[in-house]
């Protein structure tokens, strides 16, 4: 058993049928020693009495708020949570397998630029009864400081008779120098507790392998005299790093028919521009990618043809 | 039909085609190296993150781009900014002082150089010669050192009477070429900063 | 104590459906995932299904999938088996199981795929 | 294709010990433990060893597990003629949990 936050506790049980539990020692946070009864969530039932209460928890029955009195009066709290271990493997119930990019994985990581800032995402179906807590820190033995807001629903989705909901949290790198070398990665861990189940979810990552740039900005088509041809111009987006000449970008210019089938024309390019050849009723897209370490690609930026 | 690819133009900077090389050379080995010793661990995620030129270079402080200087974060360790020398500089009209970021490379190329022809000569003698270590690479390293120009001590490479165990060689190769590869990022961005510059 | 008993086994043709099911007593059955396990005669054990706690979630075996669904009815205790397309090569000793770090397992059921 | 690979069959005298060795890799026994079972003819398989080393109550001592890197082993120490019977070793892959991996099965013989 281990203190989650004040007057909280999480009971770890190895879950099978018949397992025999665990022994807990509940201790009222009293100066008193006499008269003390003991009694679980809204039940009047009496489950004790004494200044300690020793109970055996086994199952989510056992668990919950277990409150000593005296008197009819309220003299403390303790809530009691469960975390499955499930034939050695922490039980995942709360959320989401987002098999993305591989199996196994709960949470995503992005980050728009190497300032040290990140979002990461969640899924689950649970709508109620459920809070998350978030911490970070980069490394592990030695951690350093990476300070975490609150996590919010963000989205709401529905998949066939399902509802999903997403929940998403922002995290800063206390002191990052956006040129630096990662040798440690960022460890995000998250709490999640539903209703009396307590799971914890872990991520770990370097800043560099979750870069996704924001889509280039202001995209713009010049057409060329007596020409099919157009000429295309982008700028870098604005939440990328600075300076461009260090933190270079490379790009792919794609010329898209209305149909899906239609075969795509694309180009890669360094530069800011491209000239391509702009077909009725097409659309042209650019995406945007670090230019030596190859992380994800932007999400397109397009405008229509005409 | 697939559009040409718009090559970049290698500008006044002589070193930044030899960078760009250099990039390529380690990545395509790396990804050859996890796709050969897939039952070793070579991925991102399962080795220790190790830096052979720790304490002993500063690439990453000595070339810090001249914006980057404000940041406290970036300042930690870093004792000199950029002072000038070497041949990839084709003009003397550079606003900022270099030949410590510049020198500071080629030292890192020069350790990495010996690290990677003492692990080839013993992945020589594995039995099994599951792994070797790309000529291309070698040579990308050396035509970049060469094109720096720095005058320095010669590394002798170290040699090893004891017989070597396989399995730590391939793993110490995958620690290597992720660490050389990060490196040669960071050079890829200072070429292209100064090349800009 | 913690009792499966299965039920459901039998001989049927190539191509035919066979329905196993396995009754729970003994243990709070909604509570814990279970799993399929068979074993073709003389050969060794291989996985076949899992299904989680409450049915959100259900993983197969690379041979029986897109022919065999696991389900549960935690109302009535009982894990299901509902077997689709059989082929001679399915024919073997079906086990149910718990899943936890100490597992039950049901007595076995024989089902025969021969025509 | 998810499989331990074990030895076809052991064999030792009464008294003496035996080893069954469950060879796997990174993603199944090198990130997870290590079950061990034992099965009489016509009888379902039993546990003997759990979360690599662990014996459930009722399981003699002379049975014992081990893991180390990608494999596992069963040791039974003092073999008697009551422990002829296939034994089986069991773990999940990393990223398919809860898809379960059995070992390819050891018939151990009391001469």
């Known amino acids: 058993i281990w203190e989650l936050k004040k007057d909280v506790y999480v009971v770890e049980l190895d879950w099978y049928p018949d397992a025999p539990g665990e022994m807990v020692v509940l201790t009222c946070d009293t100066p008193e020693e006499d008269g003390i009864t003991w009694t679980l969530d809204q039940s009047s039932e009496v489950l004790g009495s004494g200044k300690t209460l020793t109970i055996q928890v086994k199952e989510f029955g056992d668990a919950g708020q277990y409150t000593c009195h005296k008197g009819g009066e309220v003299l403390s709290h303790s809530l009691l949570l469960l975390h499955k271990k499930e034939d050695g493997i922490w039980s995942t119930d709360i959320l989401k397998d987002q098999k993305e990019p591989k199996n196994k994985t709960f949470l995503r990581c992005e980050a728009k630029n190497y300032s040290g800032r990140f979002t990461c995402w969640w899924l689950t179906t649970i709508s109620t009864d459920l809070t998350f807590s978030v911490k970070s820190s980069r490394g592990s033995s030695d951690p350093q400081g990476v300070t975490c807001g609150a996590a919010t629903l963000s989205a709401e989705r529905v998949r066939g008779d399902n509802k999903e909901y997403e929940y998403s949290v922002e995290c800063q790198e206390d002191s990052a120098c956006p040129a630096a070398e990662e040798s440690l990665p960022i460890e995000v861990m998250v709490d999640a507790v539903h209703k009396l189940k307590y799971e914890n979810y872990t991520s770990s990552f370097f800043i560099r392998d979750i870069i996704k740039p924001d889509p280039p900005k202001n995209l713009q088509l010049k057409p060329l005299k007596n020409s099919r041809q157009v000429e295309v111009s982008w700028e870098y987006p604005d939440t990328w790093s600075t300076p461009h000449s260090y933190f270079s970008l490379t790009f792919c210019v794609q010329v898209q028919g209305k149909s899906k089938r239609e075969k795509k024309d694309r180009v890669f390019t360094d530069k800011t521009s491209a000239t391509v050849i702009c077909r009725k009723n097409a659309s042209i897209s650019v995406r945007a990618q670090d230019r030596y370490y190859s992380s994800s690609w932007s999400e397109w930026a397009s405008v229509p043809c005409s | 039909r697939n559009l040409p690819v718009a090559t970049p133009d290698p500008g006044m900077f002589p070193c930044l085609h030899h960078s760009q090389n250099l990039l390529r050379a380690v990545s395509n080995m790396l990804q050859k190296a996890r796709q050969t010793l897939e039952f070793y661990p070579c991925t991102s995620e399962e080795i220790d993150h190790e830096d052979i030129t720790k304490d002993k270079t500063s690439t990453v402080e000595a070339c810090l781009p001249l914006e980057l200087t404000k940041n406290e974060s970036c300042l930690n360790s870093r004792e000199t900014s950029f002072i000038t020398n070497g041949s990839c500089l084709a003009s003397r009209k550079t606003s900022f002082m270099m030949a410590l970021c510049l020198s500071s490379i080629y030292e890192d190329l020069k350790m990495y150089q010996v690290e990677f022809k003492t692990m080839n000569a013993k992945l020589l003698m594995d039995p099994k010669r599951q792994i070797f270590l790309d000529q291309n690479m070698l040579a990308v390293i050396d035509e970049l050192m060469q094109a720096l120009n720095f005058n320095s001590e010669t590394v002798p490479q170290k040699s090893s009477l004891e017989e070597p165990d396989f399995y730590k060689t391939k793993i110490k190769l995958c620690i290597l070429l992720h660490a050389f590869r990060i490196r040669a990022v960071t050079i890829d961005r200072v070429m292209s900063y100064l090349n800009a510059s | 104590q913690v009792q499966l008993v299965q039920s459901g086994g039998g001989v049927v043709q190539p191509g035919r459906s066979l329905r196993l099911s396995c009754a729970a007593s003994?243990?709070?059955?909604?509570?814990?995932?279970m799993h399929w396990v068979r074993q073709a005669p003389g050969k060794g054990l291989e996985w076949v299904a899992f299904?989680?706690?409450?049915?959100?979630?259900?993983y197969y075996a690379d041979s029986v999938k897109g022919r065999f669904t696991i389900s549960r009815d935690n109302s009535k205790n009982t894990l299901y088996l509902q077997m689709k397309s059989l082929r001679a090569e399915d024919t073997a000793v079906y086990y149910c199981?718990?899943?936890?770090?100490?597992?039950?397992w049901g007595q076995g059921t024989m089902v025969t795929v021969s025509s | 294709s998810y499989v331990l690979t074990q030895p076809p069959s052991v064999s030792g005298t009464p008294g003496q010990r035996v080893t069954i060795s469950c060879s796997g890799g990174?993603?199944?026994?090198?990130?997870?433990?290590v079950k061990w079972y034992q099965q009489l003819p016509g009888t379902a398989p039993k546990l003997l060893i759990y979360?690599?080393?662990q014996r459930p109550s009722g399981v003699p001592d002379r049975f014992s597990g081990s893991k180390s890197g990608t494999s596992a082993s069963l040791a039974i120490t003092g073999v008697q003629a009551e422990d002829e019977a296939d034994y089986y070793c069991?773990?999940?892959?990393?990223?398919?949990?809860?898809?379960?991996?059995f070992g390819t099965g050891t018939k151990v013989t009391v001469l």
């Open positions: 003994g243990f709070t059955f909604s509570s814990y995932g």
């Open positions: 990174r993603s199944n026994i090198g990130s997870n433990t």
């Open positions: 979360g690599n080393d």
């Open positions: 299904i989680r706690y409450d049915g959100s979630n259900k």
């Open positions: 199981k718990t899943h936890g770090s100490h597992d039950n």
């Open positions: 069991q773990s999940y892959d990393r990223g398919t949990h809860p898809l379960t991996i």
